[in-house]
């Protein structure tokens, strides 16, 4: 029978399928930075090249007993999860091991950097097919380790990292916090977050998705035919590295941005019980469990988007938060969220040639998040139109005036500190299709895009009665690109996208105050890409 | 994800008042010193000196050599363990923490990070 973890990540129609590149050979290479490994193990024999790379600190303690089988345990298991003959995700994939962790599983940032540089050198000396780097390790936040991951990712290498086993915010650890790596948390057979005693999987906005990481059967270094079970975010990351290897085997030209978007889009959604995570992290943590996506040939030119949360701005009066998309992605909309509801809105601005999503805290606020909607839009040409705040009592309108440009998102930013003088801005789909409409003292920003066959429409849903949140979803075949909260109560916490669902959050106290006439409305902009059609606004 | 998380950044940017050397005296350090927020994971005595993005190969070597020379002048021996050329410009050095102020004032230095542990997950 198939182990639970493989059954979970590989849909039935993929089970027997062999992934091969178009010319028939599987050219993907996975580099594993970990402990030493037992290359003669039956699971991985003939698939593994043990490089001569070794950069590890000395083991702790005076009584340390060095046994090869114990030194090799972690790395051998992970090599088996990636490409093992029986229990591997990407059974035919060739793997190169670099030793950056000692027999106790400890390494250094510097040793890891030298390992990453070794991979870059190998790439320069002998260019090959797609490279996947598996980093089943974590240390404290390191600017240089994150920077090295960024540099390597920009050369076309796909890096997959463990989120960490500290039951903590993954953003506090490296390489998990590097935006250019695919960061993986761990779930168990019940699709719940992995608990490891008092500790467990890391979580938060720096995690891209989760994968099986509890009681994973894989190669044991105790003997060449032994198997054992291990748990952790390393095992989860190894599953995703295997999935990525299979995706690249079929389609070697997939980029990091495409791989990440497809992993997110085709993952299993909403099965994780978010109550396991700290309350303030629940909204930031993706409820996604990895599965092997179908090939792009099977799924056509779907519009793929993901939500990227900024770091928390902090509570100072002028604190701003910034969310960025990956270089290949288009920022189609920007919204903001504050737990206290005290925020001065959000906007899109260009920094160093890249559009970024900004949010501003308000006086007395505990801080804000900027929430970017980052999408893959082939051959897109996007721009921002903004209108400064109108005089009191007047509406501000912004629409996409360029030919064939469609509205993909609206942002609103209030000049005034006093939250009571302003009403929330509004999007109007019926009266003024494709316009962003702002009220008193709001600057309005419209995100307008032109791309072959891109069409968009607004979908609204309002609730008059008491409700902590209002949601509106884009229907099948459409992708959520923009999400806003409209007039309603005087105090809304903001809006954000969860997969294809637009969530507008309302302050608890506001719920009680509200009269039935003041509906809170969640407004979604839903788009789709139909390559044969012209760009259009759908009413 | 790219914001610095729970992370220690220490400004050791002091105006240089060293030995009257023209290039040194003129250079005020704007580089920062960073280290892991979890003290137990720190490796004091080993530092990654990260240079500005556009630093050329020869300049990396010169900067490392300059640090050795200036340290020796103060009676310190430092060991350059590795030079990074391919992923980022910089070098790994074993030295006393007393020399951090000096190292931060070197031309081309963007920041210095104390080495720290990573762990199998």
């Amino acid at each position: 029978s198939i182990p639970w973890n493989l059954e979970r990540i590989i849909p039935a129609w993929h089970q027997t399928e062999e992934d091969r590149s178009p010319d028939g050979s599987s050219q993907v290479e996975v580099y594993l930075l970990d402990t030493s490994i037992q290359g003669a193990h039956r699971e991985i024999e003939g698939r593994v090249t043990i490089t001569d790379f070794n950069s590890v600190p000395e083991e702790d303690g005076t009584r340390f007993h060095r046994q090869a089988s114990k030194c090799d345990s972690h790395g051998t298991h992970l090599a088996g999860v990636v490409s093992g003959r029986d229990a591997g995700v990407a059974k035919g994939t060739s793997l190169h091991s670099l030793r950056v962790l000692n027999c106790q599983g400890k390494g250094t940032v510097s040793g890891t950097l030298i390992g990453l540089e070794f991979i870059r050198k190998s790439q320069l000396i002998q260019p090959s097919g797609p490279l996947v780097v598996l980093l089943p390790l974590a240390g404290g936040y390191s600017r240089i380790l994150n920077a090295a991951c960024r540099h390597l990712a920009r050369t076309g290498v796909v890096l997959v990292a463990a989120a960490g086993n500290f039951r903590d915010d993954a953003c506090l650890y490296s390489p998990a916090s590097a935006p250019e790596v695919i960061t993986v948390g761990a779930t168990n057979a019940q699709d719940q977050p992995v608990t490891l005693g008092t500790l467990g999987t890391n979580f938060g906005r720096c995690v891209d998705l989760f994968a099986p990481g509890k009681d994973i059967i894989g190669a044991s270094s105790d003997c060449s035919t032994c198997f054992m079970s291990q748990s952790g975010t390393s095992q989860a990351a190894a599953h995703v590295a295997g999935i990525v290897a299979r995706m690249l085997s079929r389609e070697p030209t997939l980029t990091l941005a495409e791989l990440r978007q497809r992993l997110i889009h085709f993952s299993t959604k909403d099965v994780i019980n978010m109550a396991w995570f700290p309350e303030d992290q629940q909204v930031l943590t993706p409820n996604l469990v990895a599965t092997l996506p179908p090939s792009t040939h099977e799924t056509g030119g779907q519009l793929l988007c993901r939500t990227v949360w900024s770091a928390h701005s902090g509570p100072t009066r002028t604190a701003t938060a910034t969310a960025r998309c990956a270089p290949e992605e288009e920022l189609l909309s920007c919204s903001s969220f504050s737990r206290s509801g005290r925020r001065r809105g959000d906007w899109i601005e260009a920094i160093g040639g890249q559009q970024v999503c900004k949010a501003l805290n308000a006086f007395g606020g505990e801080g804000v998040y900027a929430v970017a909607r980052c999408c893959l839009v082939p051959r897109a040409n996007c721009s921002i139109h903004n209108t400064p705040a109108a005089r009191a009592g007047l509406e501000t309108h912004v629409h996409c005036h360029q030919k064939d440009h469609v509205l993909t998102g609206c942002s609103f930013h209030w000049e005034v500190e006093d939250l009571s003088v302003r009403r929330q801005p509004a999007l109007r789909s019926r009266r003024q299709p494709g316009q962003c409409v702002g009220h008193q003292a709001a600057s309005v920003y419209a995100s307008c895009c032109h791309a072959p066959g891109l069409e968009c429409k607004i979908k609204e849903h309002g609730i008059s009665g008491p409700s902590e949140q209002v949601t509106v979803a884009c229907e099948a075949g459409w992708t959520l690109t923009g999400c806003n909260v409209l007039p309603g109560a005087s105090l809304t916490l903001g809006a954000y996208s969860v997969d294809n669902l637009c969530v507008a959050r309302v302050h608890d106290t506001a719920r009680a105050d509200r009269t039935s006439g003041e509906a809170t409305v969640a407004a979604a902009i839903c788009c789709r890409s139909r390559p044969s059609a012209k760009a259009s606004w759908v009413q | 994800q790219d914001e610095d998380g729970d992370y220690e950044e220490l400004m050791l940017a002091l105006p240089s008042q060293e030995d009257g050397l023209a290039d040194e005296a003129a250079h005020v350090a704007t580089a920062t010193f960073r280290r892991c927020s979890k003290e137990a994971w720190r490796l004091p005595g080993t530092y990654i000196v990260v240079l500005m993005e556009e630093t050329q190969r020869l300049q990396i070597e010169q900067t490392a050599h300059r640090l050795q020379t200036r340290a020796a002048r103060r009676g310190y021996v430092i060991k350059v363990l590795h030079i990074f050329y391919d992923l980022f410009p910089g070098f790994l050095v074993k030295m006393s923490s007393d020399l951090l102020g000096l190292a931060l004032k070197l031309p081309h230095v963007e920041y210095i990070e104390e080495d720290s542990f990573v762990f199998a997950q």
Partner: antibody
Framework: QVHLVESGGGVVQPGRSLRLSCAAS????????MHWVRQAPGKGLEWVAL????????YYADSVKGRFTISRDNSKNTLYLQMNSLRAEDTAVYYC???????????????WGQGTTVTVSS | QSVLTQPPSVSAAPGQKVTISCSGS????????VSWYQQLPGTAPKLLIY???KRPSGIPDRFSGSKSGTSATLGITGLQTGDEADYYC???????????FGTGTRVTVL
């Protein structure tokens, strides 16, 4: 349910030996470091020894170094403390405790047994 | 004798706040993770705080930890009679290669 149950305590004469056991259940024993901690009557906690998850390394308090040996049998989910050359000052309740994690042993202990009493007296 | 020093006792009325200090050196508290343990009379110790300020699940947020330099502090707010116990700090000592506990503090609810 996570459980640690100590056994093997008793009254022993100075200079003699005793072996304590700690049976673990409800968790993956081979994924965690394990400690022994003792508490003399009316006194505070005193750490005794630590063993890594795979048994590859051990640490001891100076007061027991050379006399006590910590070991484990991962196939039996059991931790041991072999106590030789016992002294009157070794009289205490001995607790076994699970390290918070395998690698970061300095994090402390998150699960404790109920303890077994060792009395060293002539 | 212990290398971590705690006050022998602290007391306060129900609902009040108490703090317990734990003083060490750079080789222990200064450079390692601090945990706090509660030992109710006649029972085994129980983990309250680890990694200076993190609470295991099931520990109420009335208990908090902090660290400054070579000292750590445990705070208990909204004191309850059930909080009467001995409290110990603990950490690894790098120079001893050993785990060390504090001297212990008895908390009395008046």
């Amino acid at each position: 349910q996570v459980h640690l149950v100590e056994s093997g305590g008793g009254v022993v004469q100075p200079g003699r030996s005793l072996r304590l056991s700690c049976a673990a259940s409800g968790f993956t024993f081979n994924s965690f470091g394990m400690h022994w901690v003792r508490q003399a009557p009316g006194k505070g906690l005193e750490w005794v020894a630590l063993i890594w998850s795979d048994g590859s390394d051990e640490y001891y308090a100076d007061s027991v170094k050379g006399r006590f040996t910590i070991s484990r049998d991962n196939s039996k989910n059991t931790l041991y403390l072999q106590m030789n050359s016992l002294r009157a000052e070794d009289t205490a309740v001995y607790y076994c405790a699970r390290a918070i994690a395998a690698l970061y042993y300095y994090y402390g202990m998150d699960v404790w047994g109920q303890g077994t009493t060792v009395t060293v007296s002539s | 004798q212990s290398v971590l020093t705690q006050p022998p006792s602290v007391s306060a009325a129900p609902g009040q706040k108490v703090t317990i200090s734990c003083s060490g050196s750079s080789s222990n508290i200064g450079n390692n993770f601090v945990s706090w343990y509660q030992q109710l009379p006649g029972t085994a110790p129980k983990l309250l705080i680890y990694d200076y300020n993190k609470r295991p699940s099931g520990i109420p947020d009335r208990f908090s930890g902090s660290k400054s330099g070579t000292s750590a502090t445990l705070g208990i707010t909204g004191l309850q009679t059930g909080d009467e116990a001995d409290y110990y700090c603990g950490t690894w000592d790098s120079s001893l290669s050993a785990y060390v506990f504090g001297t212990g503090t008895r908390v009395t609810v008046l």
